[in-house]
């Protein structure tokens, strides 16, 4: 009689599920360029702000094409993962004055939340390499001042953009090989 | 429709091989890692080995390290887990399972006996 | 030994609530990874149930909840009918074993 009818699909398959990786990243950059621009308006920016907790940026676009699909993702969820830290910190330690960026700091933690849960999927899928997705981290400390805490917040959404920017152009080039 | 249809099962004594196969369809086979999952009779759920969506990582349980290598075939859609040196502790129905898994086949009988 | 640690049975009455508990460590469950659950019905090959902690795939009723808090996850099934009676299986990946790891399963009894 031939072999019992399978499975309906169940989930996307997993080109499908880079496509709506990119989606929801993309749709993450749109709203950290919008809070940034937020923050800017009510706290302008004197200069650049770094925060040396922050991850270095990952690869420049021009080295795109070099890039091998189980590095991109481990190293995007590990950046990633270090923003999500960072934003829950500002959100706790980051003082009254950040308070008129809520709510769109709590769905911006969720949505990178969301995003970081997706790239988990993705590489369980594809059986990739996986780190683990919560490493324990040494405790951020706590702003000097309410400008600190500005400062911080600067720093920690500018490097948040340039880094969904660069995941946005990686994820696109990864799915042509995949 | 997802499809998985193992084969390569059967009958065969301590220290012997087997090759089983999975031949799979419904789906795009070279975009999802693919797993060997055991079921001993009357027990639980034990991972085998797991291959990645390209081939180039492959890890393996504890249990058959050295003795079991699974590989799979893009081009033909079919994973494969060539068994050898078996002992009567590998007696299993044998599931080749793809992605989290998200799908499962529905088994082919290994027997290791004398 | 299972690496995940299940309660062997459970059971319920039609229409009730019942739970099964999935409890790991840290390198799994507790280091991060997502939590799957498959149901397995009398003879047949399992079939997945939940991934992600608490993702229904399609097909799947909303009766099927997961969650998962800290080193430890769990099944609900609310509104339990005949049909829910299966043994139910947890699994994570493991960052030490680099692949997934098993509970040992649950027989659920619908009484």
């Known amino acids: 009689p031939g072999p019992p009818p399978g499975p309906p699909r169940v989930s996307p398959d997993p080109r499908a599920e880079l496509d709506s990786t990119v989606l929801l990243t993309r749709s993450l950059l749109a709203d950290t360029r919008q809070l940034a621009a937020q923050l800017r308006d009510k706290f302008p920016a004197d200069g650049d702000h770094n925060l040396d907790s922050l991850p270095t940026l990952a690869m420049s676009a021009g080295a795109l094409g070099a890039l091998q699909l189980p590095g991109v993702l481990t190293r995007l969820r590990a950046d990633l993962l270090s923003y999500l830290r960072h934003v829950q910190w500002l959100r706790r330690a980051g003082g009254s004055s950040l308070k008129t960026l809520e709510p769109e700091l709590g769905t911006l933690q969720a949505r990178l939340d969301r995003l970081l849960r997706r790239l988990q999927l993705l590489m369980s899928r594809l059986a990739l390499p996986q780190p683990p997705p919560d490493p324990p981290a040494p405790p951020l400390a706590p702003p000097s001042s309410a400008w600190g805490g500005i400062r911080a917040a600067h720093a920690i959404l500018g490097g948040l953009h340039l880094t969904l920017d660069w995941a946005v152009r990686g994820l696109l080039l990864l799915k042509t090989r995949l | 429709e997802v499809q998985l249809l193992e084969s390569g099962g059967g009958l065969v004594q301590p220290g012997g091989s087997l090759r089983l196969s999975c031949a799979a369809s419904g789906f795009t086979f070279s975009s999802y890692g693919m797993h060997w999952v055991r079921q001993a009779p009357g027990k639980g759920l034990e991972w085998v080995s797991v291959i990645s969506y390209d081939g180039s990582y492959k890890y393996y349980a504890d249990s058959v390290k050295g003795r079991f290598t699974i590989s799979r075939d893009n081009s033909k859609n079919t994973l494969y887990l060539q068994m050898n040196s078996l002992r009567a502790e590998d007696t299993a129905v044998y599931y080749c399972?793809?992605?989290?898994?998200?799908?499962w086949g529905q088994g082919t009988l290994v027997t290791v006996s004398s | 030994q299972s690496v995940l640690t299940q309660p062997p049975s459970a059971s319920g009455t039609p229409g009730q609530r019942v739970t099964i508990s999935c409890t790991g460590s840290?390198?799994?469950?507790?280091?991060?990874?997502?939590v799957h659950w498959y149901q397995q019905l009398p003879g047949t090959a399992p079939k997945l149930l939940i991934y992600?902690?608490?993702e229904r795939p399609s097909g799947v009723p909303d009766r099927f909840s997961g969650s998962k808090s800290g080193t430890s996850a769990s099944l609900a099934i609310s509104g339990l009918r005949s049909e829910d009676e299966a043994d139910y299986y947890c699994a994570a990946w493991d960052g030490s074993l680099n692949g997934p790891v098993f509970g040992g399963g649950t027989k659920l009894t619908v009484l």
């Open positions: 399972a793809a992605g989290v898994p998200d799908y």
């Open positions: 840290s390198s799994n469950i507790g280091a991060g990874y997502d």
């Open positions: 992600s902690n608490n």
